[in-house]
Interface confidence: low
């Protein structure tokens, strides 16, 4: 549960109080800096007197609730917290076309962590107008493009002033194709390897699969300087090579310098293009494998080696890169790459114009259609210090609640706000205070964040000679006496020199002089005992160890233990504490408890005879929900199956819906149509009754696979 | 390449402001942070600021009250403007291009700056 | 702000022999400590980012290595041309600082 804290700037700033009952349990420690290091869920409690005569003093260690269970008062109880303070909070604003806009708020808190202790912040992310572009033209190099080459010489600058009208940050590379240098798709006559083109006279370069020229930059001359130093080559054939280049550049992305921003492919070309098993064709066996191969002058250097891809490993590939992109092609081939455009997603085809001008407007409308992703990354952390996120995207697809190292929101619009849960947790003390960087991969701005560590307990300077301790036999801090040399006791009321008298053993026996001092479980000083670790009584005869576990763990964590017996916290019962009184697991979804086919104990469902499932809402020898419903979906959904002519009446209950989400996981029922044909659905109780989510499956397509 | 230039008088009055451009040719000002650096006489060198690709600025506490640094991306130029200047403002300016890692990559030949009346 | 101290202040060297020049930092700077050569009526040239990344153009006698607090600037081999000033600057936490500089001179 959230709580809003008051920092001392003065400003809000939300936090998580820790489940205390998580990971263990509070165990005895001598003292209160030990205490409190060593689990998150210690307190200690530094009230005088509050351990009994020969009570180790280590038992002022312990759970919170233990210790006010024990008579301890809460203003004595010593629990530092990790706290927050946010130093500065500029509010989200969208600035000028990107410029000077604040999209990540907060910009400076200061962390203090309580080892063990997750301290949870929220940190939002606006995406303003002005998100960055990456884009990597690509270009189709054989002769029949000696025309074009000349117009893409020009297009940098123009790429640059279009999309700095949307954005601030613009990089622009670009790669040049023109097909595998082996028989047929390119001569190899020496004289033709060497200078394909027909003119003895023109610049030409010899024929290559790809390069890769220039890597992503912002420098519009750049990309006219090295567009300037290409030569259009020659091939054989009519359809290209450019699969084998648009996979390169999605998978080499260290080469070609892809940032995490919105990337743009430009695909220019006349002509179409080989696939996989056109390698065959020229010796060539080896399926492409998915991987890089540019040389360090950014060549391709395997294309003899492997086939070209096929279309779904392109799209995988370019999916997987989040790359969108843009087939500028010639008006003859149009129609293919239309059709290509179906199987690749997020992609757009355009008709390519004499001027270019208008590979420049397909640009600027793929831009604005692009679905971003917004991730939030981090600097490196201290040692001991760990980091997840916690993803709140407000979109289609929202990651709500999902942990990671990183946060990461898809599709983010313009002037959409989303939000990251940043939980940081330390497990041990920092040395010094750490600066961590959290910032949106590919935007400028950072949230700082201080971290420090809280690992000393605050219970004021030791009082020298204290009166408490045997009229200043020894020294007080935070509760107990750290004794003068040759002086013993919990407050210092021994002298090492009486230690061995046998009268004072006595004191540490039963009263019948029978068995070991203080029940073996402590130490007989100065006629008391001082008893270890979880024991305690006048004699050690009680341990506070010996309760009943539930999953490993004493009074399951929500009790404590005294002399053998859980005592548990108000909404729990059982001889381990292990029976929870809510009954929030039992509730069907309908209302009830399990199903009115069980009753609730410990918060699960008990069923009865018959029925089964955590909510005793499947029963033996019924139909599954996909059976029961199967009809009513193809029916509802299709038209068509056994309950056609009357579906209205039959299943007069059952809202039918068309979905088309993406992930079928194992709630979904398939099933086939009456002309067998492969569909899914989801079973919903919703308040209004049955609600069935049908997905029509595409034909030739199993997504089972 | 990237290309930096610093212009601006070599000589300023004490207590007036001090103003420098920095002229980038070969990389669009709205890419990358840019900053501004100076060398005293002694050797000693001290960042004084930037502005970054979205316009926003960070500044030397020890400066902040008297420097401001602003750009014109139409010109592809920056600005530093430093007031209320004493002779210990005397020092070589240099503009660089930098980055949130701090490092300068590329610096102009930096401007010799004196404060004298 | 963070204090960057570099030593010795000069150091006389002979030509070919190998040399470490020493930056501390008053707190952690994990790696983000920038090394920079100086010759005289010169702007500064960048040697080393990030403690030990050469970077492109700059001879390979040139190294780094350190982290947190302690750093040390490597010339492995020198040669006339590098008696100059070398600069650390650290780039973790704003304002970015210099040292003071280690000017090599020659024996």
């Known amino acids: 549960e959230l709580d809003t804290k008051i920092t001392s700037s003065g400003e809000a700033a939300e936090w998580e109080d820790p489940d205390l009952s998580l990971q263990g349990s509070c165990q005895p420690v001598p003292s209160c800096q030990k205490c409190i290091l060593s689990h998150p869920s210690c307190a200690w409690c530094k009230q005088l007197n509050f351990t009994a005569s020969g009570e180790a003093e280590a038992r002022r260690c312990a759970r919170r609730e233990e210790l006010l269970a024990r008579g301890c008062p809460a203003q004595e109880l010593e629990e530092p917290r990790g706290r927050q303070e946010v130093l500065q909070d500029k509010p989200l604003s969208q600035g000028d076309r990107g410029e000077g806009a604040t999209q990540l708020a907060p910009q400076r808190i200061r962390v203090t962590l309580r080892p063990g202790e997750p301290q949870k912040f929220r940190v939002r992310f606006l995406r303003a107008a002005g998100y960055p572009v990456d884009l990597y033209y690509l270009m189709d190099l054989s002769y029949s493009m000696k025309d074009d080459l000349e117009r893409v010489r020009q297009l940098g600058h123009a790429l640059l002033v279009r999309l700095q009208e949307v954005t601030h940050s613009v990089r622009i590379g670009f790669g040049s194709f023109v097909d595998k240098t082996v028989l047929p798709f390119v001569s190899t006559v020496p004289s033709k390897l060497h200078h394909p083109c027909p003119s003895r006279l023109e610049r030409c370069q010899p024929p290559f699969s790809f390069h890769h020229v220039l890597s992503l930059t912002g420098d519009a001359q750049a990309f006219e300087r090295e567009v300037g130093r290409q030569n259009v080559s020659g091939n054989l054939d009519s359809p290209e090579g450019g699969f084998d280049a648009i996979l390169q550049a999605a998978l080499c992305q260290e080469q070609i310098g892809w940032r995490n921003v919105s990337r743009l492919l430009v695909f220019t070309s006349d002509d179409t293009f080989h696939t996989a098993g056109d390698g065959k064709l020229g010796g060539i066996f080896m399926p492409s494998d998915g991987r890089c191969h540019l040389d360090s002058n950014g060549v391709y250097t395997n294309s003899a080696e492997f086939d070209y891809p096929s279309v779904g490993q392109v799209a995988q590939a370019l999916t997987a890169a989040n790359i969108q992109p843009i087939f500028a092609v010639t008006g003859a081939t149009l129609p293919v790459y239309q059709e290509l455009r179906q199987l690749i997603p997020k992609s757009a085809v355009g008709e390519l114009s004499e001027d270019s001008s208008n590979v420049v407007q397909l640009i600027m409308d793929a831009y604005d259609s692009l679905s971003s992703t917004v991730t939030l990354e981090h600097s490196p952390l201290p040692p001991g210090v760990s980091i997840s996120f916690e993803s709140h995207c407000k979109g289609p697809e929202k990651t709500e609640g999902e942990a990671g190292d990183r946060g990461q929101c898809n599709d983010v619009r313009v002037n959409q706000t989303v939000d990251f849960w940043v939980t940081l947790q330390a497990t041990h003390c920092l040395p010094e205070a750490h600066v961590l960087r959290l910032w949106a991969l590919g935007f400028s701005e950072e949230l700082t964040v201080e971290l420090h560590t809280v690992c000393d307990c605050n219970c004021g300077d030791a009082q020298p000679h204290a009166p408490y301790c045997s009229d200043g036999q020894g020294d007080l801090q935070c509760g107990i006496c750290s004794c003068a040399p040759g002086r013993l006791g919990q407050l210092c009321e021994c002298s090492e020199a009486d230690l061995s008298s046998p009268d004072l053993e006595s004191g540490c026996r039963a009263p019948n002089g029978t068995g070991p001092l203080c029940s073996g479980k402590g130490r007989c000083q100065c006629g008391r005992c001082s008893c270890s670790g979880q024991s305690s009584g006048r004699l050690c005869e009680c341990d506070d160890a010996s309760c009943e576990r539930h999953e490993g763990i004493l009074c399951g964590g929500f009790g404590h233990c005294q002399c053998g017996v859980c005592h548990c916290h108000a909404n729990h019962t059982g001889r381990a504490c292990e029976c929870s009184k809510s009954v929030d697991s039992c509730v069907s979804p309908e209302g009830g408890l399990c199903s009115g086919h069980g009753y609730c104990k410990c918060n699960r469902c008990q069923c009865l005879d018959g029925y089964y499932g955590a909510l005793c809402d499947q029963c033996l020898g019924c139909k599954s929900p996909c059976e029961q419903y199967r009809d009513c979906a193809e029916c509802g959904a299709f038209g068509t199956g056994p309950l056609a002519a009357n579906c209205s009446v039959v299943c007069a209950d059952v809202n039918v819906t068309l979905t088309l989400a993406p992930n079928l996981d194992d709630g979904w029922c398939k099933e086939r149509t009456i002309d067998n044909q492969l569909f899914f659905f989801l079973v919903e109780h919703a308040a209004s009754g049955i609600v069935l989510r049908v997905r029509p499956q595409e034909k030739g397509v199993d997504h089972t696979r | 390449e990237v290309q930096l230039q610093e212009s601006g008088p070599g000589l300023v009055k004490p207590s007036q402001s001090l103003s420098l451009t920095c002229s980038v040719t070969g990389f669009f000002i709205t890419n990358n942070y840019w900053g501004w650096i100076r060398k005293f006489p002694g050797n000693k060198m001290e960042w004084m600021g930037y502005i970054s690709y979205s316009g926003s600025t960070s500044y030397n506490p020890s400066l902040k009250s008297r420097i401001s640094i602003t750009r014109d991306t139409s010109k592809n130029q920056f600005f530093l403007q430093l007031n209320s200047v004493t002779t210990e403002d005397t020092a070589t300016y240099y503009c660089?291009?930098?980055?949130?890692?701090?490092?300068?990559?590329?610096w102009g030949p930096g401007t010799m700056v004196t404060v004298s009346s | 702000d963070v204090v960057m101290t570099q030593s010795p202040a000069t150091l006389s060297v002979t030509p070919g022999e190998r040399i470490s020049l020493s930056c501390r930092a008053s707190?952690?700077?994990?790696?983000?400590l920038h090394w920079y050569q100086q010759k005289p009526n010169e702007s500064p040239r960048l040697l080393i980012k990030y403690a030990s990344q050469s970077i492109s153009g700059i001879p390979s006698r040139f190294s780094g290595s350190g982290s947190g607090t302690d750093f040390t600037l490597s010339i492995n081999g020198v040669e006339l041309e590098d008696l100059s000033i070398y600069y650390c600057q650290q780039g973790n936490s704003l304002p970015n600082t210099f040292g003071a500089g280690t000017k090599l001179e020659l024996k």
């Open positions: 707190e952690s700077v994990d790696t983000y």
């Open positions: 660089a291009m930098t980055g949130s890692s701090g490092y300068f990559d590329f």
